[in-house]
């Protein structure tokens, strides 16, 4: 009966962590089993940046220094599983640490929303849908933005309601708007750590319409119609 080396559960272990993670944070773990049932001791090899330590018994991996995404991501090290006792046979796997952006990008509009209009006069309150985004990386789920009007003075004329984590609806509260452009300020919060907020402007024009399009003198482009 030949003694066999420990067997890792995966060829490569991968973990993702924010680059601003606190020192001492658990960033991942590895697991191996010994065919003979012997205990296993884990160690790291090739941690040239000195960022990591491994719990020899559990295989949990912790940060021991500040992580710097600019140094290059992913950061790859080898993990060694060695039998305790017996022939001290060992196996090698890899641990890849992918460093994520910190939440450092405020929300913004996902598209260019110039050219929004309603036909004047409004026959009934109208609404339009807009989308927000940011340039941060979102793990497990997409962004979860919250939306509100950017100033209190807008609340007599407008209301904003969340549709989902990225989309919201801007609605008129009445039909008594002048025939001109209104700039509606929207406050978008990303709920991140730390939470970042962006104030964006949606320019909405109330204009006379011809065949469902905003009437403009020659040389002006038609605007997009929203209900």
């Amino acid at each position: 009966d030949v003694n066999e080396a420990p067997q890792f559960s995966q060829h490569v272990f991968q973990a993702k962590v924010s680059e601003d993670v606190a020192i001492g944070t658990k960033v991942g773990n590895v697991t191996a089993k010994d065919p003979e049932g012997l205990d296993i001791s884990y160690s790291l090899r090739g941690d040239t940046r000195g960022w990591l330590k491994i719990d020899h018994v559990t295989g949990e991996i912790f940060s021991v220094a500040p992580l710097d995404r600019e140094a290059g991501s992913p950061y790859r090290v080898q993990v060694v599983a060695t039998e305790v006792g017996g022939s001290s046979l060992s196996s090698v796997s890899e641990f890849h640490l992918i460093l994520m952006d910190v939440n450092d990008n405020p929300p913004r509009l996902a598209k260019d929303y110039t050219g929004l209009f309603f036909c004047h006069p409004l026959s009934a309150p109208g609404s339009l849908i807009f989308e927000a985004t940011d340039d941060d990386q979102h793990l497990f789920r997409g962004p979860h933005f919250t939306f509100s009007l950017g100033s209190g003075s807008l609340q007599n004329d407008w209301e904003v309601s969340k549709i989902n984590g990225t989309h919201a609806r801007l609605s008129t509260r009445h039909t008594e708007f002048e025939e001109r452009e209104y700039v509606v300020l929207i406050r978008i919060n990303d709920g991140g750590r730390p939470p970042l907020e962006g104030i964006v402007s949606l320019p909405v024009t109330f204009c006379s319409c011809v065949e469902g399009s905003c009437f403009r003198p020659a040389g002006h482009k038609h605007h997009h119609h929203h209900h």
């Epitope: 060829h11 490569v12 993702k16 090899r45 090739g46 941690d47 040239t48 290059g72 991501s73 992913p74 950061y75 790859r76 090290v77 080898q78 890899e94 992918i98 994520m100 990386q137 979102h138 793990l139 497990f140 789920r141 997409g142």
Partner: antibody, heavy 119, light 113 residues
Framework: QVQLVQSGAEVKKPGASVKVSCKAS????????MNWVRQAPGQGLEWMGA????????NYNQKFKGRVTMTVDTSTSTVYMELSSLRSEDTAVYFC????????????WGQGTLVTVSS | DIVMTQSPDSLAVSLGERATINCKSS????????????LAWYQQKPGQPPKPLIY???TRESGVPDRFSGSGSGTDFTLTISSLQAEDVAVYYC?????????FGGGTKVEIK
Amino acid sequence: QVQLVQSGAEVKKPGASVKVSCKASGYTFTDYWMNWVRQAPGQGLEWMGAIDPSDRYTNYNQKFKGRVTMTVDTSTSTVYMELSSLRSEDTAVYFCARGGYGDYWFANWGQGTLVTVSS
Amino acid sequence: DIVMTQSPDSLAVSLGERATINCKSSQNLLSSGTQKNYLAWYQQKPGQPPKPLIYFASTRESGVPDRFSGSGSGTDFTLTISSLQAEDVAVYYCQQHHYFPWTFGGGTKVEIK
């Protein structure tokens, strides 16, 4: 065997958005990263970004950040790439490409989707 | 970002002769943590997606003929076709898979002389 089947060719106007799909089969979908690589006519290859279907983590090429969005539907093993604010220089063939076993080279490729941006 | 520079831009080789393509990286692609070079090579024929040939600088993808070999370490890498066949006419690209963002060389067009 591994198969990546992409959606058909698209013609878009400048300023519009395009959404390309890539349906994967023949392997455990959540075990491998999916990348998007584009190739302008007569030009070389350019990596746009990648998504890990296991947790929806995305890593975008800075050049496309703010214009590209990669999403995944694990129920259908499909990855999507949406590119917004299109301009004529975005005319290219867009490929999805699965990561390799244990690392990040491109082991399997879709057939490509031609996106033409023209007014 | 890591810049990958290929040479030559094009190469004409007689059938049965050796073709050599070079790829130079602006950063070291040898990981001191794993002792692997994170460099891949691809072959692309007109109207087709690229096909992987080599990864980790010298590991051949399954099904790739053994006339294709990769060598080099650190910043300088080579793809060698030991005996060029007609079906090897294509554009060849190197790619680093060491650090995000993954980047490609500009390509080398291989033709028959």
